[in-house]
């Protein structure tokens, strides 16, 4: 809203004169612009002790402008006020300030926050979270075969991030250690570069991991009765609620 | 708190004159210019008349040009509507309203009824 | 004068609803309008000024938008106490000229 101005006009008339100049229509010498042409803001400069009329091509900084059918005048606005809409009603404070509902406020109100790129006092935003993805498959090393203990992931996302007094994000991820039935890669999961050393590896590890658990879920191939499988069934479903149990005290969270 | 209190409507044959006031209180009066608004039963907003805040101007719309006058007194914080040559169509509740570029405070109106 | 437009004249919805009130001026007005509410037998209330600036103690679910001709008042909820009628203003010219308002009804 700043002013192009309109230069003052330098011969001044001891009365009111139609020979002005720099956007005045009349003019005197002690008061300046009287009035303005077509479309031009009349504004009064305090200079001193006495007010100067000056024509402008739009209102200046701390003014607002009101478009009489007779004449485009200037009004003050608040003291502490850069741009306004009328008197009761800022749009832009000035530096040191902040707007709050149309009116300038050194600080902001409880329960809001200053805006230092806007000079604005806003509402604090706190940090959204959506819900956890479903848990990952069980992995190791990239891979869902060829071993009993591993990992897995769930995730979530941030919806929406906080303003700078808004609570933090929690984390992101979760990891936890997860035990499944041990399955053999078929060939497509297996690297062709030392297949044979990752199988002599694999064959070592599942050993110890066997010998190491009294569950070994299932790796024979022999054949049980109804009655066995479902006693199997039970044990092993005690044996994953004492797992989840243990589970949830190991979890590894990482903040996004 | 801001008050703006009309008063002076009723009811008023065709061609006879009435004059509203409105006193203020609660901000500084001197410093706004000044409006009527009226509203028709079942009708919109119209702007009536303005004057500005030191009175030396006054502004109307055409239908009430010659009619009517806007005044203000701001020793006594009291804008006036003086209306002459009243018609049927100027039936409606009067407002006054702080008037700066919007209008910022109103009163509760007062209802001038013009019927014979 | 400078013609303002608002549409639509009447308008039936419920609360909890997304409501849209446009208005349309005859010529540019810049970010030079006002919306007020009234409710019967009562005075117009200011709710925003500047086409998007919300008046101290109007509720956040108001807001407004446009510049230069088009403008729009959107209530994002609506509470049974916004049932009245909305009318616009521009306040670029200084003869103000309104809306011829729209009244906001319960379904």
């Known amino acids: 809203q700043n002013a192009s101005r309109g230069r003052r006009q330098r011969r001044m008339h001891p009365n009111v004169s139609q020979g002005c100049q720099g956007g005045c229509a009349t003019c005197s010498d002690y008061n300046g612009c009287l009035s303005c042409k077509p479309r031009l803001f009349f504004v009064l400069e305090r200079i001193g002790m006495k007010q100067i009329g000056v024509c402008l091509s739009s209102c200046p900084s701390g003014y607002y402008g009101t478009r009489y059918p007779d004449i485009n005048k200037c009004t003050k606005c608040k003291v502490d006020c850069d741009t306004c809409f009328n008197k009761n009603f800022c749009t832009k404070c000035k530096s040191g300030f902040y707007l709050h509902l149309g009116k300038c406020l050194d600080s902001c109100p409880e329960g809001l926050e200053a805006n230092n790129h806007t000079m604005e006092c806003v509402s604090i935003v706190h940090c959204e979270a959506s819900e956890w993805s479903p848990w990952s498959p069980c992995m190791k090393k990239g891979k869902t075969c060829g071993f009993k203990r591993g990992t897995e992931t769930r995730v979530r996302d941030i919806l929406q991030h906080p303003s700078a007094k808004g609570n933090l994000c929690p984390p992101t991820s979760e990891t936890r250690t997860c035990i499944v039935q041990r399955k053999k890669c078929s060939k497509g999961e297996r690297g062709k570069k030392g297949r044979e050393r990752k199988r002599k590896k694999l064959n070592k590890e599942e050993r110890k991991e066997t010998s190491s658990s009294s569950d070994s879920k299932g790796l024979e191939s022999s054949i049980e009765t109804p009655d066995q499988q479902e006693n199997k069934e039970r044990q092993q479903q005690q044996k994953r609620r004492a797992r989840d149990k243990q589970q949830k005290s190991v979890s590894v969270s990482t903040v996004h | 708190e801001v008050q703006l209190v009309e008063s002076g409507g009723g009811v008023v044959q065709p061609g006879r004159s009435l004059r509203l006031s409105c006193a203020a209180s609660?901000?500084?009066?001197?410093?706004?210019?000044m409006a009527w608004v009226r509203q028709a039963p079942g009708k919109g907003l119209e702007w009536v008349a303005t004057?500005?805040?030191?009175?030396?101007?006054?502004y109307y719309r055409d239908s009430v040009k010659g009619r009517f006058t806007i005044s203000r007194d701001n020793s006594k914080n009291t804008l006036y509507l003086q209306m002459n040559s009243l018609r049927a169509e100027d039936t409606a509740v009067y407002y006054c309203?702080?008037?700066?570029?919007?209008?910022?405070?109103w009163g509760q109106g007062t209802m001038v009824t013009v019927s014979s | 004068d400078i013609q303002m437009t608002q549409s639509p004249s009447s308008l039936s919805a419920s609360v909890g609803d997304r409501v849209t009130i446009t208005c349309l001026a005859s010529e540019d007005i810049s970010n030079d309008l006002v919306w007020y509410q009234q409710k019967p037998g009562k005075a117009p209330k200011l709710l925003i000024y500047a086409a998007s600036r919300l008046q101290d103690g109007v509720p956040s679910r108001f807001s407004g938008s446009g510049f230069g001709t088009d403008f729009t008042l959107t209530i994002s909820s609506l509470q049974p106490e916004d049932f009245a009628t909305y009318y616009c203003q521009q306040s670029y010219k200084y003869l103000p000229t309104f809306g011829q308002g729209t009244k906001l009804e319960i379904k």
């Open positions: 004057i500005i805040y030191d009175g030396s101007r006054t």
């Open positions: 309203a702080a008037h700066d570029r919007s209008f910022d405070y």
């Open positions: 609660g901000f500084t009066f001197s410093d706004y210019d």
